[in-house]
């Protein structure tokens, strides 16, 4: 008789999840000498331990602490790039400018990027059929709690000038409900961070508006200023040209606005 299984509203665990996490860990630790000491089997065991046999709507940051400890990594605190709703360009940027880091350039972010996972209460099974959706089911699900935990730690580690890439094509360029707006903004440490510098990425070819004057950017500025951190903003009108100028800063076309 097939056992009754909870149906959630979100997609199930990514297929071959354990193998994917383990393979990513091995690849990352091979590429990054400073993380060569990491035992990837222990990392997987800690990852699994955070959600297996637990109700997928009752996950806590505490559940992820063993994984956080194993994945502890020192990233230069003044080289942090946050992003919201524009992950691909942020990653393209750090692939060119190798000394800047998004969360997904760290071991823990790299392991989980684009993956979904959850278990079931009181069984050691991984649920490949469905997982809780943040809105429709519950916010304390394994994926959301993981990203909240690692994002908080990443923001807490930042110092000096912190950069954030924002999507100028969205109706809310700054969204208070995004991970950036709800977690990272509130966990920047004013005693360490002097300025948050926002790069607003334009989508349209002929879009010459100053999106740094957008009401949601003004809202971000207000939140940041109240936290005693300075705020600055730059329109990136041509993201393609921006990346080209990052690759080749001395190119003569890089004298004008990018």
């Amino acid at each position: 008789v097939p056992r009754w299984r909870q149906q959630w509203s979100g997609p199930g665990t990514t297929k071959r999840f354990p193998e994917t996490v383990l393979a990513r860990c091995v690849k990352y630790t091979e590429i990054h000498p400073e993380m060569r000491h990491v035992d990837c089997q222990s990392v997987w065991d800690a990852f699994k331990g955070a959600f297996i046999s637990k109700h997928p709507c009752n996950i806590t940051e505490e559940d992820y602490q063993p994984l956080m400890k194993l994945g502890t990594q020192t990233v230069p605190c003044n080289k942090i790039l946050l992003w919201s709703r524009i992950k691909d360009l942020a990653h393209q940027f750090t692939q060119v400018q190798r000394d800047m880091f998004t969360l997904e350039d760290t071991l823990l972010g790299y392991l989980a990027d684009d993956l979904t996972w959850c278990g079931e209460f009181n069984t050691s099974k991984i649920n490949y059929q469905s997982c809780p959706d943040w809105r429709k089911d519950c916010s304390n699900n394994p994926v959301s709690v993981f990203w909240k935990t690692v994002s908080r730690r990443f923001a807490e580690a930042a110092c000096d000038v912190v950069h954030v890439m924002l999507n100028g094509s969205r109706s809310k360029i700054f969204d208070k409900n995004s991970t950036f707006g709800s977690v990272e903004v509130h966990n920047l440490q004013p005693e360490k961070v002097q300025t948050l510098e926002a790069w607003v990425i334009h989508g349209g070819r002929e879009d010459s508006r100053d999106l740094c004057q957008d009401p949601t950017i003004k809202e971000l500025e207000s939140i940041i200023s109240k936290r005693n951190i300075q705020f600055s903003c730059k329109n990136i009108y041509r993201p393609d040209k921006f990346l080209q100028c990052v690759k080749n800063p001395e190119d003569s076309s890089c004298t004008s606005e990018i």
């Epitope: 003044n78 080289k79 790039l81 940027f93 400018q97 000394d99 800047m100 000096d160 000038v161 950069h163 002097q194 300025t195 510098e197 926002a198 790069w199 300075q230 600055s232 903003c233 730059k234 990136i236 921006f242 100028c245 990052v246 800063p249 001395e250 190119d251 003569s252 890089c254 004298t255 990018i258």
Partner: nanobody
């Protein structure tokens, strides 16, 4: 190759002000993070202030906060350091530096690629 030339140094009494300038030869300079460092004989170059290329975000050493202001005029390819309420411990050779990486800004002197020759600032008590 970017050439940087500092000016504006001199002798000033404690409590006085100076404005240092750093002119860059390179037209793409506007996108580069720029920094000011100071050095006294027998010591390492010490970070004073820096400014990002894209949005002009400023970063200051604790000793410079509230007294010094870094700014830039990209049309003139120049970065400035306005120094107020100067003290004898501010004495040294002030160097301007450029980092050709777009984005990011650092206190680490080794990360700046281009350097000027320096301008002497002497603060007498």
């Amino acid at each position: 190759e970017v050439q940087l030339e500092e000016s504006g140094g001199g002798l000033v009494q404690a409590g006085g002000s100076l404005r240092l300038s750093c002119a860059a030869s390179e037209r793409t300079f506007g996108n580069y993070p720029m920094g000011w460092f100071r050095q006294v004989p027998g010591k390492e170059r010490e970070f004073v202030a820096a400014i990002t290329g894209l949005a002009g975000s400023r970063l200051y050493a604790d000793s410079a906060k509230g007294r010094f202001t870094i700014s830039r005029d990209n049309a003139k390819n120049t970065v400035y350091l306005q120094m107020n309420n100067l003290q004898p411990e501010d004495t040294g050779v002030y160097y301007c530096a450029a980092d050709r990486r777009i984005g990011g800004v650092t206190r680490e002197s080794r990360e700046y690629e281009y350097w000027g020759q320096g301008t002497q600032v002497t603060v007498s008590s």
